[in-house]
Amino acid sequence: KSPIFGPQEVSSIEGDSVSITCYYPDTSVNRHTRKYWCRQGASGMCTTLISSNGYLSKEYSGRANLINFPENNTFVINIEQLTQDDTGSYKCGLGTSNRGLSFDVSLEVSQVPELPSDTHVYTKDIGRNVTIECPFKRENAPSKKSLCKKTNQSCELVIDSTEKVNPSYIGRAKLFMKGTDLTVFYVNISHLTHNDAGLYICQAGEGPSADKKNVDLQVLAPEPELLYKDLRSSVTFECDLGREVANEAKYLCRMNKETCDVIINTLGKRDPDFEGRILITPKDDNGRFSVLITGLRKEDAGHYQCGAHSSGLPQEGWPIQTWQLFVNEESTIPNRRSVVKGVTGGSVAIACPYNPKESSSLKYWCRWEGDGNGHCPVLVGTQAQVQEEYEGRLALFDQPGNGTYTVILNQLTTEDAGFYWCLTNGDSRWRTTIELQVAEATREPNLEVTPQNATAVLGETFTVSCHYPCKFYSQEKYWCKWSNKGCHILPSHDEGARQSSVSCDQSSQLVSMTLNPVSKEDEGWYWCGVKQGQTYGETTAIYIAVEERTRGSSHVNPTDANARAKVALEEEVVDSSISEKENKAIPNPGPFANEREIQNVGDQAQENRASGDAGSADGQSRSSSSKHHHHHH
């Protein structure tokens, strides 16, 4: 399938001009290669009419140009002084020959309709209203006023000043005068449909002294806006229907032969194919709203329409806006798993892609919620503190430069199952959707921390150990201290890694963390995890409480927080070496705006502005004698 996209059908009238935009994939080669516009002949040959190399055919001389817009990945063909001879089949394309990548465009140029002289032509879009102006002489002021629509032989009454109204115009047509002006009457027709198009005659008075005015009403379907999007990217349909429908229910539907199937509306209807990847957002009181769809699939391509009606369904005679969506399969967005599976008590590490050219953009992770119009509250971000209900079990690790950041969620429960979005405050096309599935755990977790009741005593030494299976032997093990700004990786020193090991004793693989001396700031959540470079694997969490020494007291964990701190996840973990880093980190505190909802989906998520290390290992550090050893027995 060709990745070139443009308008399938273009229509105009003689003497007018057209502007045809063609889209191409975002590559350096495409930006620089020849662009062409050719006409298809009966033999299948396509004769060049104009190209970006400077060629211009005789028949286009002085009336056409082709402009490349590499920054938009589009080129535009402008043709003026159209004649009926320009009607035909064309291709816009890329390549050194006209057999390159191309898109078929049909151009139809019609004759200007012959209208009686001095006909007033009104052009309106479907669903809108028009006010026809009917001037008359003062002597006809007392006479009957009327508007009729011309049919083949006769003129069928629409409305007159005696309040007669044609049944098909009841509730839609109104005849009125304005103020003291006794030389014009007006007829307003609302909820225009294609059937309303045609010739009308206004009349004031009867017989030879009557004043008549010819009116041509053109009712147009809106030109579809072309949207060119990459597979797996996201698209926003910005719908602006006007104040007159501000209070009506809104919808987005996709054309399916003769009908338009509703995908989503503001009354709660949603197509199951779009579950987890669609939001509808009212923008303001002027009838504007937007629909965001993420994780585009090739079957999402097609003709979309937005509209407004109390039923939340398409209705003839109501305003609409249309789009033609093309999904380019030559996508720059990497193909990642769209479903991630975890088990209760376990953890997941989700790799979120972002535009590598925007490594400094703010990264976010939100949970899609389908209630109402759908919304996506932010759970964590590079500069957004973790939502309270995710305390101790959610962190975002930003890895600038490689086009990926990682979100880790542990202590999983079945309630965590659902849809999540990766998004940034940069390129909105890179919003991606992940479905998290959580099954009941059927085996022991891969990582286990001892002791489970972790209460450290102020001023003393406290050690916790993380047991891991042999399959993780060659991977980098780490401990990190969780805060609501991320999980700050703690220094570790692996003595075992320097020893050669032939066999692996399942019962004795552990990585320990020692707090020495324990301080009040040491209280909190700690994670033990495995990773390979910047690829994160499983984690488990433990809450360490800090108490003052009391004589004869046995230390009991005051919370049952660790009851949910065991972990067991998928076994896709890769090898790594162990890094050495310095000691305990204190995250930088910073201001924080608490507007956390990515609900205004047309805008970017720019709402959280804190400064924290969000999982980086280069925040402030303080020295102490804490040591974190990997022990191998």
Partner: nanobody, 120 residues
Framework: QVQLVESGGGLVQAGDSLALSCAGS????????MGWFRQAPGKEREFVAD????????GYADSVKGRFTISRDNAKNMVTLRMNSLKPEDTAVYYC?????????????WGQGTQVTVSS
Amino acid sequence: QVQLVESGGGLVQAGDSLALSCAGSGDTFSNYAMGWFRQAPGKEREFVADISWYSANIGYADSVKGRFTISRDNAKNMVTLRMNSLKPEDTAVYYCAADRNHWPVKGDYWGQGTQVTVSS
């Protein structure tokens, strides 16, 4: 056919107001739907606002909605564009256009234009 002459342009500060007028002569003014278009340096001419023969139908470009108001007085052969809350991006040559047969106005007849400059 109608001849059109614009007036009222000038240099104003951002946030100020200005009223442009267009006087028609040579034919019955009410025979023409009227409009305003503008052209900024290096840009194409763009639609601003239009008004049908007897003022019943009015259209505005999104960029000026709520700030600009078009009106006409057929007795005085005049169409006026009142511009409030002007922005630097409103800087352009403003043209008056007339169309005998069409609304929205396509522009069968044009004036010479009047310069509007909005400084920040």
